[in-house]
Interface confidence: medium
Amino acid sequence: FKNDATEILYSHVVKPVPAHPSSNSTLNQARNGGRHFSNTGLDRNTRVQVGCRELRSTKYISDGQCTSISPLKELVCAGECLPLPVLPNWIGGGYGTKYWSRRSSQEWRCVNDKTRTQRIQLQCQDGSTRTYKITVVTACKCKRYTRQHNESSHNFESMSPAKPVQHHRERKRASKSSKHSMS
């Protein structure tokens, strides 16, 4: 789509908007029970995946002047990951218990893993349209952080001096997982 100049995402505080009657929001529904194991269970940096909840989010996107013509569906990676040893029959046996006890100053968080880029069209207050290229989350993973680690926020990409885009959510859960840029 042709787009006039290089619009930067620009936002105002927005209130949630009602869901479109035809949209099916499945927010807060954990996928596959929310438990995802890595192949070996031994790559303790990123691929030990237990209790990483993947919540389905359906929301409208707004940049202040425009809102998406249809809801955006993506995953929200939520919460902390449970330590593996609390589960029965863990592949690592007793070793895992020592491993976790030695690392009590660390925690595992559910973070974005896989993403994909898609175009989304917004309708604007002056009756025109605008197209953005956005990155949506398609899978989550557990990642280990030390207590002192400053977790990198999974916010929108900063794009010059503009404020982040706002999401009109169809339900309650906030998401800061999509990255947005102009196409």
Partner: antibody, heavy 121, light 112 residues
């Protein structure tokens, strides 16, 4: 070519309701938002708000929250403005309007012919 | 909301002579992306408004080149190099940088 054709003039009594229609043609209706603009007799233009024609989500300017309702019938490419509990000060010409293709901020290029709503006892 | 103030309210002009209308906004209309969303409309008697100039200085298709726009920040001007009879009507400036979209009060151009 893009056309926005509005319903005819209405005369209503205070307290009544009125529904103005705006039928769009010449483009894909659900791709472009629809704005509504009010012009009281001999006065300037007031932007009332707009409706996302795909999602049906309306946005109202502060002065038009409450009694004013934007709606759609996408099957006939028509946007509606309903005004409830009419007051004498609602007497005005109401325009539906649309912007240009893929050019945000390039002005409102397409306007309906306007619908005069007169509220009088 | 951004308040748009136009002057003069009324502008009597002579055919073939230039005319100028001013529009001032209560806050800067320059967007963080560098664009300035200031537009000019003409409403001829008994008609709907029509777009003349968009984004300060861009003429909309079919608009004669005797119309030109200029300005930045909060001060903008619409100029007609040589007024013709068909130019009579009310001219409005409008901004869409900020939400909500707002219009000026209008300037009535009439032939002397």
């Amino acid at each position: 070519q893009v056309q926005l054709v509005q319903s005819g003039a209405e005369v209503k009594k205070p307290g009544a309701s009125v529904k103005v229609s705006c039928k769009a043609s010449g483009y894909t209706f659900t791709t472009y938002g629809m704005s509504w603009v009010r012009q009281a007799p001999g006065q300037g233009l007031e932007w009332m708000g707009w409706i996302n024609t795909y999602s049906g989500v309306p946005t109202y300017a502060d002065d038009f929250k409450g009694r004013f309702v934007f709606s759609l019938d996408t099957s006939v490419s028509t946007a509606y403005l309903q005004i409830n509990s009419l007051k004498a000060e609602d007497t005005a010409v109401y325009y539906c309007a649309r912007g240009r293709e893929y050019y945000y901020g390039s002005g409102i290029a397409f306007w309906g012919q306007g619908t005069l709503v007169t509220v009088s006892s | 909301d951004v308040v748009m103030t136009q002057s003069p309210l009324s502008l009597p002009v002579t055919l073939g002579q230039p005319a100028s209308i001013s529009c001032r906004s209560s806050q800067s209309l320059e967007h963080s992306n560098g664009n300035t969303y200031l537009h000019w409309y003409l409403q001829k008697p008994g008609q709907s408004p029509q777009l003349l100039i968009y984004k300060v200085s861009n003429r909309f298709s079919g608009v004669p080149d005797r119309f030109s726009g200029s300005g930045s920040g909060t001060d903008f001007t619409l100029k007609i190099s040589r007024v013709e009879a068909e130019d009579v009507g009310v001219y409005f400036c409008s901004q869409s940088t900020h939400v909500p979209l707002t219009f000026g009060g209008g300037t009535k151009v009439e032939i002397k």
